[in-house]
Interface confidence: low
Amino acid sequence: SPQNPGCPNAEDKNFPRTVMVNLNIRNRNTNSKRASDYYNRSSSPWNLHRNEDPERYPSVIWEAKCRHLGCVDADGNVDYHMNSVPIQQEILVLRREPRHCTNSFRLEKMLVSVGCTCVTPIVRHVA
Amino acid sequence: SPQNPGCPNAEDKNFPRTVMVNLNIRNRNTNSKRASDYYNRSSSPWNLHRNEDPERYPSVIWEAKCRHLGCVDADGNVDYHMNSVPIQQEILVLRREPRHCTNSFRLEKMLVSVGCTCVTPIVRHVA
């Protein structure tokens, strides 16, 4: 929908710092097709760890931890000439404000590891 | 902080559907050390595309698109026995409610591609 004329962008300095948010989530089922097994089939496989916090919305977030320092080759051996590294994403969560538990939150940034990818190490040439 | 006794979890059915949210973000600088070049060094490299929407908070989100169908081998050639696939993450964003532009939002789920990983294809044996 086009922005209402005169509405400041939510990231502008003059935007109200406290807003009303409706928690009835739109697009609730975006993940219905996402039962992916990439974590197991990747050359940089990862495990998923449950991060739970009742003071946060969403209260459960899954974090990826790479299984190896190296990457898995076609024969299933770990090749240490390559590195498995976490791909990180900054997400927004709602953190309950402790003084007004029922309906007051603050936006919080979280850095989460979503999965792993296999990279060539940075080679330093020493003179 | 421990949950205030009697506070319902924000995902409970009886939790208020409209809440107050403070937009002064906590942990604003979580990404200060993250100038990562994994997108270029990965065996499943990706490009980053800017997705901008002034009706959304955050208004700018970067989306990954895998560069190849296959994965890049040690010699820099694309190996089509492996597949580059996007790692997706479900994130929460705030969507401006069109009727009350200044301070009313609704939570919305978005599925974003954060990066790519290299996977072994699922081989189907045909009888």
Epitope: E63, L69, N83, V85, P86 | K33, S36, Y38
Partner: nanobody
């Protein structure tokens, strides 16, 4: 430049205990993962245990319940406490770490580093 220095290897009796330690030094910004691998004569290098920045740990099935990995973030040090040692634990133990660090004004977000290895011999 980042260096990993191991200590604590040596000869130990079967059923005994040994503690290895490894310290990372250099212009380190953060250590994502620290851990131990081992290589027995004529065999491939294999994972023993890894500990992640959040504190969670992963172990090889062969050492679960006998070995414990821990780390001291303030000292950039990882420890491996080995109990109920068996002859098949005899190997060169290598410290490994995935480290973000500065070098020549550039931030390297992630690179694997290895120690020189320390020999652990379990006599039966």
């Amino acid at each position: 430049e980042v260096q990993l220095v191991e200590s604590g290897g040596g000869l130990v009796q079967a059923g005994g205990s040994q503690r290895l330690s490894c310290t990372a030094s250099g212009t380190i910004v953060n250590i994502h993962v620290m851990g131990w691998y081992r290589q027995a004569p004529g065999k491939q290098r294999e994972l023993v245990a890894l500990i992640f920045s959040g504190g969670s740990a992963d172990y090889a099935d062969s050492v679960k319940g006998r070995f414990t990995i821990s780390r001291d973030n303030a000292k950039n040090t990882v420890y491996l406490e080995m109990n109920s040692l068996k002859a098949e634990d005899t190997a060169v133990y290598y410290c490994a770490a995935e480290i973000g660090y500065y070098s020549g004004g550039t931030y390297y977000s992630s690179e694997a580093h290895w120690g020189q290895g320390t020999q652990v011999t379990v006599s039966s």
